[in-house]
Amino acid sequence: NFMYSKTVKRLSKLREYQQYHPSLTCVMEGKDIEDWSCCPTPWTSFQSSCYFISTGMQSWTKSQKNCSVMGADLVVINTREEQDFIIQNLKRNSSYFLGLSDPGGRRHWQWVDQTPYNENVTFWHSGEPNNLDERCAIINFRSSEEWGWNDIHCHVPQKSICKMKKIYI
């Protein structure tokens, strides 16, 4: 019957994700018992995405690889609301790689998922970015300006933030 086939589909979808996420936390979306959205445990969720703060210190390239192994990317921040959600889980004395880089050192910033870089929706600290050698972006806390972005050398190890779309089952 219908409920049985729906359950089978869910189970196969869960098996798909099990290789990198042994445990998922799911919530019912809306009033329909058939629609569940999930994030890997212990990722956090905001709108249609899941977020993971990686506390291991790695270069930007290794951080992105680490996210991709989990089916995610380094975080792409699209709105002020999204940034405000993310910073609730960050430590003020740490810096975290974003999915934003300037691969050619030409001040042509680009997001890892090819989201167009929009100068009007950026949260650089004042006077940033400011160095052709610093081709990767972090988010960090400055007492004068709170949380914002800074450009740094990509090979300098930092913590990072991964982001993936919610899993719908």
Partner: antibody, heavy 118, light 107 residues
Framework: QVQLQQSGAEVVKPGASVKISCKGS????????MHWVRQAHAKSLEWIGV????????NYNQKFKGKVTMTVDTSSSTAYMELSRLRSDDTAVYYC???????????WGQGTLVTVSS | DIQMTQTTSSLSASLGDRVTISCRAS??????LNWYQQKPDGTVKLLIY???RLHSGVPSRFSGSGSGTDYSLTISNLDQEDIATYFC?????????FGGGTKLEIK
């Protein structure tokens, strides 16, 4: 202290090539890109381009594309700029300068005079 | 390319004078304006970066100001060793470009 030591003056014939060097000391060479700037006699400064000492890639001023090739040798902390198909109007002092924060060139070499003459 | 214009190509002043050198960009350069000093022997030194920040080792008599397209360098108490040509440079957009220079002489 930061120092950029450039190679000596060169006199070359039209159509020939010349390679000038810039050795960095007093800092971690691969942490800072190297810019090249030229100044023709009694003229202003002209930005030629910049090479990343870490990645090895270059950004050239369109005006100098095809004229200039920038390279680095990290083992000797030296940046090089080769000028090809030289003409008399390439006669100038060529400077190397270290990249710094706020899109600036914070330390400069002493300059290398290249004279193109038959 | 962004054009940088230093309208005064040479300037004569007396020791102890306050001297101001101006520089205009053909478009807004978001304060990414730097000043360099070139001595008669060809030596080039950075003086001021990001409009108003003093580079290490530069005497405090040098100061910079401006915003948008208009910037200036001020030497508050002219010294004999300030005899040089001064260049502005924008770093806002590649290719980086320089002003034509202002040669400072002593009266």
């Amino acid at each position: 202290q930061v120092q950029l030591q450039q190679s000596g003056a060169e006199v070359v014939k039209p159509g020939a090539s010349v390679k000038i060097s810039c050795k960095g000391s007093g800092y971690t060479f691969t942490d800072y890109s190297m810019h090249w700037v030229r100044q023709a006699h009694a003229k202003s400064l002209e930005w030629i381009g910049v090479i990343s000492t870490y990645y090895g890639d270059s950004n050239y001023n369109q005006k100098f594309k095809g004229k200039v090739t920038m390279t680095v040798d990290t083992s000797s902390s030296t940046a090089y700029m080769e000028l090809s198909r030289l003409r008399s109007d390439d006669t100038a002092v060529y400077y190397c300068a270290r990249n710094g924060n706020f899109y600036v060139m914070d330390y400069w070499g002493q300059g290398t005079l290249v004279t193109v003459s038959s | 390319d962004i054009q940088m214009t230093q309208t005064t190509s040479s300037l004569s002043a007396s020791l102890g004078d306050r001297v101001t050198i101006s520089c205009r960009a053909s478009q807004d350069i978001s304060n990414y304006l730097n000043w360099y000093q070139q001595k008669p022997d060809g030596t080039v030194k950075l003086l001021i970066y990001y409009t108003s920040r003093l580079h290490s080792g530069v005497p405090s008599r040098f100061s910079g100001s401006g915003s948008g397209t208009d910037y200036s360098l001020t030497i508050s108490n002219l010294d004999q060793e300030d005899i040089a040509t001064y260049f502005c440079q924008q770093g806002n957009t590649l290719p980086w470009t320089f002003g034509g220079g202002t040669k400072l002489e002593i009266k």
